[in-house]
């Protein structure tokens, strides 16, 4: 077959080819930020000629044109300046209201490099209607100016702009408009990952919150867990594998879907995941009817086995057939469970469609969506039971109208997005499911996104201050209890002056709490073995502090998961009959277990906990410490089996002031405290200028650094004695 000509350069931009110069290859243009390619793409036809999708006239030279944002068509009850036909990137538009009207939304908006306005639609409202004035987004025209219960407003976009959101909205009895705000956008515009992740995440969290009724009950935790177990989510992942998707992009689709699966399984809900790849025909790789769809590893391995070449013979984009296979799956499950049963009716369904273009065969995908809505009986009362997310990737031939038609429309939420490329998709899926926004006491959740603050990454982390100076660290293990080291409290029992500083989203300095009571392990006595020549002994170096008030859960304050509790069992996604031994075997399962602690400056530092034979050689070094242990004969007199050991090779060593802080591991996007920092042979902070300076021990140091942490698996009786009514412990 003839190849297509290579004179396809774009001035000021670059291009990529999905399958070289061969027929069927898609050429995609890209331009620097603030410019867009015209045309966006070309397809190599079997005749050896390039064709521009949607173009009627012959091939024109590809150019990078400046991005512009749409102008307001009308602005009610106020004025806007400057008045232009469209606005350049970086250009501003300002809004003011007439007397008697109050401005809601953004008074000044700036045109962003993706052709989208920042901020929110400006509305001049006098509060007269049953519903607030829904406003008119930039570039839109609205018909309907009554805002009473039952009144409808309709929107259309001016000139060649595309409408996303709801073209018709109704004022509902609760004073909220149905659907989602319509936005008029340039056909070439796309969404930035940093906008999509929170929008997608908010919507998803709403759905997961509804699936996980823990937030709605004030009953005992045992009851709470039963309720949690009754929530069920079916997640359907639809991956476009058509000709225009390159193999590399398909890999990123798969990777992004894996991230999503991984993240969704970290929620404490029951979830079944279906995987469907599609081109001209759909291929079901995992069905929700298969028991394996509830098993994260099985789902991920079926994703990994998804093969780009599976769809070699049919390379069109049949979105209808893909959605129809979801419908058929739902139909089978309904017949299996019984249409009238709670088991069927209480399942929530989320469909995520990852595509790079418009459907070009098989009929309108909207028909399949209508069938799905019908079988799930989606009406105003059951609106929460279905969410369809339509994500277009590659801004080239993506059909905004179609995506918008497929995506769900819910107030304050967005379900249809177009991203510039698969890298952006990956970023979105990395950050969208930020469980840390949940307000209940779900444990072990840290915000892992790149722009999160240190406190958001480790929201359990607290600082303990005897008077003014910080002394020790600790970890929230519930909304009122902190776990720390006993050796921090050496002034007898007067804790009236002590404070615990807990993370607070409203203040970078955190919030101070008084201590209601301190429970210090009675077994702790630093001088216990002085007569054996052991000048300091840290056995039982553990304490609990009950704060004077409960901590309000937030992105900055949330407990860590304690192993051997039901809470941790849920987070580990272990079966109900699991024991404390099972948790230890799962978490401390290697000779060298990667773990972390939090530094004085709040950053997360890495260590390796040595287990088994390696624990013995890690601890042996203590015999070289002649000042603290002048005539030590048996290392186990000092390093009992209560301690975990780290500090070999590239490990960071904790400073004295980091004592009491959690030693924790990450599993399934959740964090589990296995130890607490107790004592060590080297202090990297000693005499430093400030909290950001740490000194590595010289290689020649004798003894070399070693750090010892109280092993929480060895402190179970004491923890159970004092936290029995705070946490739900598993059998030993």
């Amino acid at each position: 077959a003839p190849s297509c000509p290579q004179n396809v350069n774009i001035s000021g931009g670059t291009f990529t080819l999905s399958h070289g110069w061969a027929p069927g290859s898609l050429l995609t243009y890209s331009c620097p930020q603030g410019l867009y390619p015209s045309p966006a793409s070309r397809l190599c036809k079997s005749s050896g000629q390039w064709q521009t999708p949607g173009a009627t006239r012959s091939l024109s030279k590809a150019v990078c044109k400046p991005v512009r944002c749409p102008a307001p068509v009308s602005f009610e009850n106020g004025i806007y300046t400057p008045r232009l036909g469209s606005y350049p990137v970086g250009g501003n538009v300002s809004f003011e209201c007439e007397d008697g009207f109050i401005l809601r939304g953004s008074p000044v908006r700036q045109c962003r490099p993706n052709g989208m306005w920042d901020g929110e639609t400006a509305v001049c409202d006098n509060g007269a209607g049953h519903c607030p004035n829904p406003g008119i987004s930039l570039g839109a025209v609205r018909t309907g100016f009554r805002f009473g219960h039952g009144d409808k407003v309709r929107y259309r976009c001016s000139s060649n702009l595309v409408l996303t959101g709801s073209s018709e909205r109704e004022c509902q009895g609760n004073g909220v408009w149905s659907g989602t705000e319509p936005i008029c956008r340039q056909p070439y515009s796309y969404d930035f990952p940093e906008d999509v992740a929170p929008a997608l995440g908010t919507s998803f969290s709403h759905m997961l919150g509804a699936t996980n009724p823990t937030q709605k009950t004030k009953e005992s935790l045992g009851r709470k867990i039963q309720i949690q177990r009754s929530g069920h989510l079916n997640l359907y992942l639809l991956l476009d594998c058509s000709q225009s998707v390159s193999e590399n992009d398909f890999l990123i689709f798969k990777e992004s879907a894996s991230l999503m699966v991984d993240r969704i399984f970290s929620f404490e809900i029951n979830v079944s995941v279906a995987i469907i790849t599609f081109a001209s025909e759909p291929k079901v790789l995992m069905s929700v009817l298969n028991d394996n769809s509830r098993d994260m590893t099985e789902v991920i391995s079926s994703l990994e086995n998804a093969n780009y070449k599976d769809h070699e013979n049919g390379t069109g984009t049949n979105t209808y057939a893909a959605l129809n296979s979801v419908y058929l799956m739902m139909n089978n499950q309904m017949r299996l469970l019984g249409m009238e049963t709670m088991a069927w009716q209480e399942i929530r369904h989320a469909i995520i469609l990852l595509t790079d273009g418009k459907s070009n065969m098989g009929g309108s995908p909207k028909t399949a969506v209508d069938h799905i809505r019908e079988i799930l009986n989606i009406n105003q009362k059951r609106n929460d039971y279905l969410d369809i997310y339509a994500i277009g990737v590659g801004k080239l031939d993506v059909d905004w109208r179609e995506l918008n038609e497929l995506g769900s429309k819910k107030d304050g939420e967005r379900h249809a997005f177009i991203l510039q490329d698969t890298k952006a998709l990956h970023q979105v899926f990395e950050h969208m499911l930020d469980v840390s926004k949940l307000t209940d006491t779900i444990c072990g959740v840290g915000n892992m996104s790149a722009n999160a603050s240190d406190q958001e990454r480790t929201p359990w982390h607290v600082t303990i201050k005897p008077k003014s100076q910080e002394t020790c660290r600790g970890a929230l293990i519930s909304d009122q209890w902190v776990l720390t080291a006993a050796h921090c409290f050496r002034d007898g029992n007067d804790h009236s002056l002590w404070r615990v500083n807990v993370g607070d989203p409203k203040s970078q300095w955190g919030k101070e709490f008084l201590i209601e009571k301190a429970v210090i392990s009675p077994g702790f006595d630093v001088f216990a073995k002085k007569n054996q020549g052991i000048l300091e002994f840290y056995g039982d170096d553990i304490a609990l502090l009950k704060l004077a008030q409960k901590v309000k859960m937030s992105t900055h304050a949330r407990p860590i998961c304690l192993p051997c509790t039901m809470e941790a069992n849920l987070a580990l996604r272990r079966p109900q009959g699991s024991t404390c031994r099972d948790h230890e075997n799962e978490l401390l399962n290697k000779q060298s277990v990667p773990a972390h602690f939090v530094a004085l400056n709040g950053s997360k530092l890495n260590i390796n906990l040595k287990m088994g034979v390696e624990w013995t050689s890690c601890a042996e070094v203590v015999s070289q410490e002649k000042t603290m242990f002048p005539n030590l004969t048996d290392v186990r007199e000092v390093v009992t089996d209560q301690f975990l050991c780290s500090g070999t090779q590239e490990d960071e060593s904790p400073c004295k002031g980091e004592s009491g802080g959690a030693v924790f591991l990450e599993r399934r996007f959740r964090f589990f405290q296995v130890g607490l920092v107790s004592w060590g042979l080297y202090n990297p902070c000693l005499g430093s200028a400030d909290k950001n300076s740490r000194k590595r021990a010289p290689r020649s140091k004798v003894p070399p650094p070693r750090d010892f942490h109280i092993n929480l698996f060895r402190m179970q009786p004491w923890l159970r004695q004092h936290l029995g009514d705070v946490l739900n412990f598993l059998p030993l």
Epitope: C472, F527, T627
Partner: nanobody, 122 residues
Framework: QVQLQESGGGLVQPGGSLRLSCSAS????????MGWFRQAPGKEREFVAS????????EYADSVKGRFTISRDNSKNTLYLQMNSLRAEDTAVYYC???????????????WGQGTLVTVSS
């Protein structure tokens, strides 16, 4: 907060010895890590030695290891620094410091003495 007062500084020949003392007022002396710092003219204040609140563990700057010994007497609320084999580069004002955590971060220390001058010269 602990109040601290150093003494024992003076002029000494290279190779000689001195013993610095630091007396602390406040009943909480026994719960503090104690340390010595020094500052030579035109230089930054630097860590010299520290001792844990128990007296069981000590740390020294590499430059003084083997020559200086830190000790404490909790019954007398006093900290000591025995300095042997003194060198010209040990000339500085010596300060004693108290720190509850034991890290002795310069930015966080709020209990310092006034300092005592040690001059090593022939």
């Amino acid at each position: 907060q602990v109040q601290l007062q150093e003494s024992g500084g003076g002029l000494v020949q290279p190779g000689g010895s001195l013993r610095l003392s630091c007396s602390a007022s406040g009943h909480t002396f026994r719960s503090y890590y104690m340390g010595w710092f020094r500052q030579a003219p035109g230089k930054e204040r630097e860590f010299v030695a520290s001792i844990s609140w128990t007296g069981g563990s000590t740390e020294y700057a590499d430059s003084v290891k083997g020559r200086f010994t830190i000790s404490r007497d909790n019954s007398k609320n006093t900290l000591y620094l025995q300095m042997n084999s003194l060198r010209a580069e040990d000339t500085a004002v010596y300060y004693c410091a108290a720190d509850y955590s034991g890290d002795f971060l310069l930015s966080d220390l709020d209990s310092w003495g006034q300092g005592t001058l040690v001059t090593v010269s022939s």
